[in-house]
């Protein structure tokens, strides 16, 4: 007959699961619930994997194991408190009085519920990793966070390598004993003791639950170490940089837990299970009855097969991992799992050339002298397009890409940003807003959306912000439609008249040349270089200054190089800004120093793409250890990431330009981190290569 | 008209922790760069680190093991925060702005605030 | 880092004289975009450093025509046509084509 084979993890576990067993026998509960005897909760996700049990009760973080490695889905769901329904919230606590923001964290003493505990360490460190504000080297977490914060409680941590940073705030108990146990014995253990260690001023910051702080003050029955504390002298730290009221949990909190619940395989029928277990709690539920689901004082433990605190058992309507778990706690759980043991030695970077080669050597050499993790290796392709075929193909890791080539890494070859390039602000040549600039006009406004028939200034055929950007974004945006793929007719037959300079005028559409002026002999017109006077983003800008055009389509530096005195030349010398707008997406007009919230699209920086399987805070976190010893070009490290000088050539391995390495944040797709509108233009324009 | 005020304590023991606090009004910090600068005794200046509209910061390599600059954009505030002071970090600190309008020259400054590092 | 090296020192000037300050920078401040990313700034007595002059010779605004900059590469020159009482003080060059920026260490603009 049909049997629900529960996996037990220890033995005060088999015995109550016997006895469950037994006692849904004797009420006639079906199916026959059987009891398998498993190591741990890791163990018996493995037996049900394997078919040899069927169902085990687990918390968030197994939960995310057992469906991510194992294809288990939760079908039934731990209620407790009535309020917060199948979940509670892990939250940051400060004390008022402090100006620690969840952006200040760093160098912060920090007070956690015990190592390896949900809202005390899972929650908090891996939501720290995975927004990018802790990096993370060589999936050694407990080193990455006793570097982070000043100094930790964290109950438990006395057995690593790095209890003197995370065990330096923890007190033991009033005699001494017990320092750093994660046990009673210490003072700060469990979520009342870290939210005292904040309270008494040994941590700035505890990781603790929702309830802990209501719980613990405002005079309700407490040790004396609580008694005179209120609950408005603490705050919570918000996400976005904000804090807020303690009691303002639901909006303002690092993420929300998700309950305990019972994991199966894929091909088991969740409702069974539901059925089975909803019969047993009806009947095994309320105190005084034969035997008791939610309790485990009999065999003295607690949270046996399910946790004490549950009130009722529900069934889970969307059976996966992810819509149990929730972003929030999902993308914690991302930041978290490292496995060192599964983390390969070494990172394959992708080298395209010579030159590249010596530099990638000397990185692998420089990186190892340090002891960085994971060791580089150069493993050399013929172009950007063979480094991502070798990336898919697992025979290489990473490589640096420019913005179109990470679309096709990203559209193609399914690859996803670990790390991106920051420049300097002065640097517009590496990373700039493509913008439309049009004069000001009050009489003969026109929108981005009234641009047929008007005339168009473009820097050059198959310049990012005079072309590809503008002529893609139209295409997208269905204003310019190409019949048989032809985009120079389209463009042609779009605007009244054009002047985009090219090399090779060979069946280009007059009216694209019209607007050209040549130089001044009136020789050389519509050429792809500066005897063309329109030709460039400074060209296409005087395009439209002289009247030629109504419309330019350049970089967001443009106008301000050209005006106010920035350029001499008696077309520009006396021009303001100010006699200049910007056309926006959403229809509207814009002063110029709008930029950064009116574009057709921002050029993004490059980014380190890699597989989606590869653990990008590994990435991240090597690169970040790496920068600290190697980004400044003037550092007597030995070797300089971001200078290819010593090297005869530029840009190898990064740009040059680079100023930093950065974290992806929530930009972890291609498309996240090109942003919406260089991908529109981009699929604008590759929508119409047949 | 764009005011930058710095606030924090003045005197701050050595190996403690600096932390000053930049309140601006006038513009938004979710737009252009905003940065630190400090002038010791004797006039010399020193670029800290900036933290961008996008969030994104850059230390002075000099600084970087020691310094954090963060930001509340719901309040208009960014923080600079020093770790393990020393007498040489005597200084008055500057918080000030650059935008494209000046090609990132630092064109507004806080009026600053002078600490001292002693015991 | 970049060195600014300001002269001279001090300059001890009469009301309604020129004033020439030099800037010397240790590379070339042209950036790889061909902008220049050389300011001025003024220091008067206990207040904050004011932007006059920015990327070369561009004053900001509200700065008198009296001041003037001038230069290319790593030379580099800051000019008072006619100077006023409220001209003293310290004045900086500043680069910012290179990171990090840096300062000169300044010149003291005083009278005779």
């Known amino acids: 007959g049909m049997e629900v084979r529960w996996c037990a993890t220890s033995d005060p576990e088999q015995h109550k699961c016997g006895n469950m067993s037994e006692a849904f026998r004797e009420a006639g509960i079906q199916p026959s619930l059987l009891c398998v005897r498993g190591t741990s909760a890791d163990h018996c996700v493995q037996l049900i994997a394997a078919q040899e049990a069927d169902a085990i009760t687990l918390d968030g973080g197994a939960i995310y194991e057992a469906g991510k490695e194992h294809g288990l889905k939760p079908v039934v769901g731990e209620v407790y408190d009535q309020e917060v329904g199948t979940s509670y919230y892990a939250v940051a606590v400060v004390r008022r009085s402090s100006h620690v923001t969840i952006d200040t964290l760093k160098g912060v003493k920090s007070c956690h519920t015990g190592i390896n505990r949900t809202v005390g360490w899972n929650v908090p460190v891996g939501y720290l990793v995975e927004s990018g504000r802790l990096s993370v080297m060589g999936c050694d977490v407990l080193k990455a966070v006793s570097d982070y914060f000043g100094g930790s409680c964290v109950p438990g941590a006395g057995e690593t390598s790095y209890s003197e940073s995370l065990c330096r705030l923890c007190r033991g108990d009033s005699s001494g004993e017990g320092v750093c146990d994660k046990s009673p014995l210490e003072r700060y253990y469990d979520y009342s003791g870290a939210f005292r260690c904040l309270a008494e001023g040994a941590g700035d910051v505890a990781f603790v639950k929702h309830s802990t702080v209501l719980e613990n003050t405002d005079g309700k029955t407490l040790p004396s170490w609580g008694q005179a504390l209120l609950s408005q002298d603490f705050e919570l730290l918000c996400r976005d940089g904000s804090r807020a009221d303690v009691t303002e949990w639901r909006q303002c909190h690092l993420a929300r837990v998700p309950a305990h619940a019972v994991v199966v395989r894929a091909d088991t029928d969740g409702g069974l299970i539901f059925r089975l277990l909803n019969e047993g709690q009806r009947l095994f539920s309320h105190e005084g009855s034969s035997f008791q689901m939610f309790s485990s004082e009999a065999y003295g433990q607690k949270d046996l097969l399910f946790k004490d605190s549950t009130s009722e058992l529900v069934p889970i309507a969307t059976q996966t991992y992810e819509a149990w778990l929730g972003h929030e706690y999902l993308h914690a759980m991302k930041g978290l799992l490292c496995d060192p043991n599964r983390l390969p030695p070494y990172l394959r970077w992708c080298v395209l050339s010579t030159p590249e080669i010596q530099k990638c050597g000397d990185m692998a050499v420089a990186f190892r002298r340090q002891r960085l993790k994971p060791e580089i290796q150069c493993v050399s392709a013929k172009s950007p397009q063979h480094c991502m075929e070798r990336i898919q193909a697992e025979q290489v890791d990473a490589v640096t890409l420019s913005g179109e080539d990470i679309y096709t890494a990203g559209k193609t070859y399914g690859l996803v940003p670990a790390a991106g390039e920051h420049y300097a602000p002065e640097d517009s040549s590496n990373s700039y807003y493509v913008v439309a600039v049009v004069r000001r006009d009050s009489s003969h406004a026109f929108t981005l959306d009234e641009l047929r028939g008007k005339r168009s200034c473009h820097a050059g055929f198959g310049s990012p912000a005079g072309w590809d950007v503008p002529v893609g974004a139209l295409i997208q945006r269905g204003f310019i439609r190409p019949k048989d793929c032809d985009v120079l007719t389209a463009v042609s037959e779009f605007f009244n008249a054009s002047c985009v300079p090219v090399n090779n005028p060979k069946n280009y559409p007059s009216s694209l040349c019209a607007l050209c002026v040549g130089d001044e002999q009136g020789r050389n017109k519509c050429v792809g270089n500066s005897q063309e006077r329109y030709y460039g983003y400074r060209g296409a800008f005087r395009c439209l200054v002289e009247n030629a055009g109504d419309v330019a389509f350049v970089r967001h530096t443009t106008v301000f190089d050209n005006t106010n005195g920035h350029n001499s030349e008696p077309w520009a010398a006396e021009l303001r800004s100010e006699d200049y707008e910007l056309l926006c997406p959403n229809g509207a007009r814009a002063e110029v120093s709008q930029f950064a919230a009116c574009n057709l699209a921002q050029i993004p920086p490059h980014a380190v793409m890699v597989r989606p399987d590869t653990n990008i805070f590994t990435v991240y976190g090597l690169l970040d250890k790496a920068q600290d010893l190697f980004g400044d070009d003037h550092n007597k490290n030995g070797f300089k990431m971001f200078d290819s000088s010593n090297y005869h050539g530029q840009d190898l391995l990064f740009k040059d330009a680079t100023v930093r390495a950065v974290p992806v944040g929530e930009k972890t797709t291609y498309r996240g981190w090109l942003g919406l509108d260089y991908v529109a233009a981009l699929e604008g324009m590759s929508s119409q290569q047949c | 008209e764009v005011q930058l005020q710095e606030s924090g304590p003045s005197l701050v023991k050595p190996s403690q922790t600096l932390s000053l606090t930049c309140s601006v009004t006038g513009d938004s910090i979710t737009s252009g760069y905003w940065n630190w600068i400090r002038q010791f005794p004797g006039n010399k200046l020193e670029y800290m680190g900036y933290i961008s509209d996008s969030g994104i910061t850059y230390y002075n390599p000099s600084l970087k093991s020691r310094i954090s600059i963060t930001r509340d954009t719901s309040k208009n505030q960014y923080y600079l925060q020093l770790n393990f002071v020393t007498a040489e970090d005597t200084a008055t600190y500057y918080c000030a702005r650059r935008t494209l309008a000046t090609y990132y020259a630092m064109d507004y400054w806080g009026q600053g605030t002078s600490v001292t590092v002693s015991s | 880092d970049f060195v600014m090296t300001q002269t001279p020192l001090s300059l001890p000037v009469s009301l309604g004289d020129q004033a020439s300050i030099s800037c010397r920078a240790s590379q070339s401040l042209v950036h790889s975009n061909g902008n220049t990313y050389l300011h001025w700034y003024l220091q008067k007595p206990g207040q904050s450093p004011k932007l006059l002059i920015y990327?070369?010779?561009n004053r900001f605004s509200g700065v008198p025509d009296r001041f003037s900059g001038s230069g290319s590469g790593t030379d580099f020159t800051l000019k008072i046509s006619r100077v006023e009482a409220e001209d003293l003080g310290v004045y900086f060059c500043?680069?910012?084509?290179?990171?990090?920026?840096?300062f000169g260490g300044g010149t003291k603009l005083e009278i005779k």
């Open positions: 990327r070369v010779s």
């Open positions: 500043s680069q910012s084509t290179h990171v990090p920026p840096t």
